[in-house]
């Protein structure tokens, strides 16, 4: 979380933005608040890329200002205008690029005063893995997909039984560049797994953590997966 | 101390290639945008071309689209001017300039390098 | 593409006047506007940036004014270091111009 406060003449308002993460070819969201004002047409929004010659957004009384846009962003950036009285300045980024990453700065004048705060993106590719049993094996096999990442993941397997054990001898994990040639799938395969035992594989990169679950006993198959972002820092 | 130094200039014939480097030092490079500035002899300054911070956007004076190139390497702190179907009148001193860290925040064009001549003759 | 136009593109004048340059954009640039002083063999400094913003170690006798299409330099007064070539450049969003420079010699 970053608090930024900024200096009118006699007044300052406080502008909170959080660091947040961007799945390449999704849209992505630009977290920023402020105090609010009473009159929209009031309020300025301005986002800001570090190093960057245009505007990233400008929204002034009430409506999008795009004159001053960089090329970059042309067509991709909207703010939630309806939010904008409560004090969300957010931005939706649409189509994340790998090159979205960077500094930003949600920067707000109101009648109140002025006010800023950077936020640190970061783009990549992360998706949720899905563990299954792989039939066509010669002995029981487990197969972890993950359909999109980057950068360049780790991948760890774990059980629940063997906790600390070291599968790394025992599994084989590729990756396959996908068609747009930047984020790949990720196969990761167990061998000589044992039933009635929960294992796990675990991605991760420096965007996203991502888990998959598979329990196996002889009645049934239970499957669980969560993906958390790593870098969700406010500011 | 901030630094810059051009190089890679020369005389090549018309329709030739050439790329010029940028080394920078003594500031966070991928901070700020750099810019390519050129004075042909005895005329005016020339904006050229810009990239942003992360190389993501690059921008072109009419006279070069098509036929520059800029582009940067964060790693190496530096920037780069593939020049391509070269003419008489590209013929200048070529500067690079640390351009805009914040738009409409911060100072631009507040540091520049030596310069390398470009000439462009048969 | 933005143009930028000087005037007057040379000026002669004496140690002690006060010199004013002005520079006309041919759509408004709001205050997106610097100016730079060049001396012979040697690359452009940043005097002037946003309109009226002193960069930081340059003379208080520099001064810049104006928005939107008119702008002005004024050297309230000249010394003998500052006989040189001027220019204005406009960076509204993502383009770079140049004017085509003003010449200030010795009367």
């Known amino acids: 979380l970053i608090i930024g406060f900024g200096i009118s003449g006699r007044h300052s308002i406080t502008v909170t933005t959080v660091a947040s993460a961007g799945n390449i070819g999704e849209d992505g969201i630009l977290s920023c608040t402020f105090e609010p004002d009473i009159k929209l047409s009031d309020i300025v929004i301005q986002w800001l890329k570090e190093g960057v010659l245009g505007l990233v957004h400008e929204f002034k009384e009430g409506k999008d200002e795009l004159s001053e846009q960089d090329e970059m962003f042309r067509g991709r950036t909207a703010v939630f205008a309806d939010q904008v009285i409560v004090g969300n300045a957010s931005l939706r980024l649409k189509n994340v690029q790998l090159t979205d990453a960077g500094t930003y700065k949600c920067y707000i004048i109101t009648s109140k005063g002025k006010g800023n705060a950077n936020l640190e993106y970061k783009t990549g590719a992360f998706s949720m893995p899905e563990v299954n049993v792989d039939y066509n094996a010669s002995s029981e096999t487990l197969r972890c997909e993950a359909p999109r990442w980057f950068p360049q993941p780790t991948v760890v397997w774990a059980s629940q039984v063997d906790q600390g054990a070291n599968f790394s001898e025992v599994s084989n994990t590729s990756f396959e560049l996908n068609s747009e040639n930047v984020t790949m799938k990720v196969v990761s395969v167990l061998y000589n797994v044992t039933i009635n035992n929960t294992y796990s594989c675990m991605i991760e990169n420096d965007i996203a953590k991502a888990t998959g679950d598979i329990k196996v006993t002889e009645s049934e198959i239970k499957r669980r997966s969560h993906l958390q972002l790593l870098n969700s820092k406010a500011s | 101390e901030v630094q810059l130094l051009e190089s890679g200039g020369g005389l090549v014939q018309p329709g030739g290639s050439l790329r010029l480097s940028c080394a920078a030092s003594?500031?966070?490079?991928?901070?700020?945008?750099m810019s390519w500035v050129r004075q042909a002899p005895g005329k005016g300054l020339e904006w050229v071309s810009a990239?942003?911070?992360?190389?993501?956007?690059?921008y072109y004076a009419d006279s070069v689209k098509g036929r520059f190139t800029i582009s940067r390497d964060n790693s190496k702190n530096t920037l780069y001017l593939q020049m391509n179907s070269l003419r008489a009148e590209d013929t200048a001193v070529y500067y690079c300039?640390?351009?805009?860290?914040?738009?409409?925040?911060?100072?631009?064009?507040?540091?520049w390098g030596q310069g390398t001549l470009v000439t462009v003759s048969s | 593409d933005i143009q930028l136009t000087q005037s007057p593109s040379t000026l002669s004048a004496s140690v002690g006047d006060r010199v004013t340059i002005t520079c006309r954009a041919s759509q408004s640039i709001r205050s997106w506007l610097a100016w730079f002083q060049q001396k012979p063999g040697k690359a452009p400094k940043l005097l002037i940036y946003?309109?009226?913003s002193l960069e930081g170690g340059v003379p208080s006798r520099f001064s810049g004014s104006g928005s939107g299409t008119e702008f002005t330099l004024t050297i309230s007064s000249l010394q003998p270091d500052d006989f040189a070539t001027y220019y204005c450049?406009?960076?509204?969003?993502?383009?770079?111009?140049f004017g085509q420079g003003t010449k200030v010699e010795i009367k």
């Open positions: 990239i942003s911070g992360g190389g993501g956007s690059t």
């Open positions: 300039a640390r351009d805009i860290q914040w738009f409409g925040e911060s100072t631009l064009f507040d540091y």
């Open positions: 003594g500031f966070t490079f991928s901070s700020y945008a």
């Open positions: 450049q406009q960076y509204n969003s993502y383009s770079r111009t």
């Open positions: 946003k309109a009226s």
